[in-house]
């Protein structure tokens, strides 16, 4: 899950074990190359962050639904 400890930007070191409903999400960012592993951080409608594995099909589908433009976390 996102971790700001000892890294220059938010990074995900573990992923959510739940497949979140798409309707609960409003946006996403892709973590930067400075992070040890690539990850997607979804933001929920309640303003919370959820880490997800970009290799999973549902994550890829959600990213398409939330916007085709690439979203990369700024550092």
């Amino acid at each position: 899950q996102p971790d700001a400890l000892n890294v220059p930007s938010t990074c995900c070191f573990t992923f959510s074990s739940k497949k979140i409903s798409l309707q609960r999400l409003k946006s996403y960012v892709i973590t930067t190359s400075r992070c040890p592993q690539k990850a997607v951080i979804f933001r929920t409608k309640l303003g919370k962050e959820i880490c997800a594995d970009p290799k999973e099909k549902w994550v890829q589908n959600y990213m398409k639904h939330l916007g085709r433009k690439a979203h990369t976390l700024k550092t």
Partner: antibody, heavy 119, light 107 residues
Framework: QVQLQESGPGLVKPSQTLSLTCTVS??????????WNWIRQHPGKGLEWIGY???????YYNPSLKSRITISIDTSKNQFSLTLSSVTAADTAVYYC???????????WGQGTMVTVSS | DIQMTQSPSSLSASVGDRVTITCQAS??????LNWYQQKPGKAPKLLIY???NLETGVPSRFSGSGSGTDFTFTINSLQPEDIATYYC?????????FGQGTKLEIK
């Protein structure tokens, strides 16, 4: 496996401030995506959500208690804390700390600590 | 705040019975509902999230359904270890609200 453990005084006098601490083990409290919550349960009653804190220090408090509560985080000790001021007998309850992974589901709980407000 | 109303407040059933608990929200909450089990003297345990998804490790005899304002929690074949109080919780809005609980006893 993340575990949570509450600690604090079991007895508090009316009008005083209640302070409780939740110690996180088996994982870093600094990990984002984890939201650290306080929830209480009055004797024989249901559950009442108090509020949460995020690793960044962002908080959200239940408006019904907002004027009396503060939730803080100490990443160096892997702990987060609740303070509740001006307590009355109505604040007598079991206080739980709990984690949610950003998905608004409390999947890990402490065992709870009973706090009695009495003179 | 959203009000969550559970019914019944208590019920008694026999081992093997199908048990149903309902939870009604005071406004539309889509499927933003969790169910918890709390055994005496213990902390609550998450059973179901998003109204119908079983949490990892939870027996398949537990299930949930519903959306909008009306939700149902079902135990298909009641076991002695299911004796507990069950709570619903909404997360459509902050602050989160819980139902008042349903206490389940064995006949």
């Amino acid at each position: 496996q993340v575990q949570l453990q509450e600690s604090g005084p079991g007895l508090v006098k009316p009008s005083q401030t209640l302070s409780l601490t939740c110690t996180v083990s088996g994982g870093s409290i600094s990990s984002g995506g984890n939201y650290w919550n306080w929830i209480r349960q009055h004797p024989g009653k249901g559950l009442e959500w108090i509020g949460y804190i995020y690793y960044s220090g962002n908080t959200y408090y239940n408006p019904s208690l907002k004027s009396r509560i503060t939730i803080s985080i100490d990443t160096s000790k892997n702990q987060f804390s609740l303070t509740l001021s001006s307590v009355t007998a109505a604040d007598t309850a079991v206080y739980y700390c709990a984690r949610d992974g950003g998905d608004d589901a409390f999947d890990i709980w402490g065992q709870g600590t009973m706090v009695t407000v009495s003179s | 705040d959203i009000q969550m109303t559970q019914s019944p407040s208590s019920l008694s059933a026999s081992v093997g019975d199908r048990v149903t608990i309902t939870c009604q929200a005071s406004q539309d909450i889509s499927n933003y509902l969790n169910w918890y089990q709390q055994k005496p003297g213990k902390a609550p345990k998450l059973l179901i999230y998003d109204a119908s998804n079983l949490e990892t490790g939870v027996p398949s005899r537990f299930s949930g359904s519903g959306s909008g304002t009306d939700f149902t929690f079902t135990i298909n074949s009641l076991q002695p270890e299911d004796i507990a109080t069950y709570y619903c919780q909404e997360y459509n809005n902050l602050p989160y609200s819980f139902g008042q609980g349903t206490k389940l006893e064995i006949k």
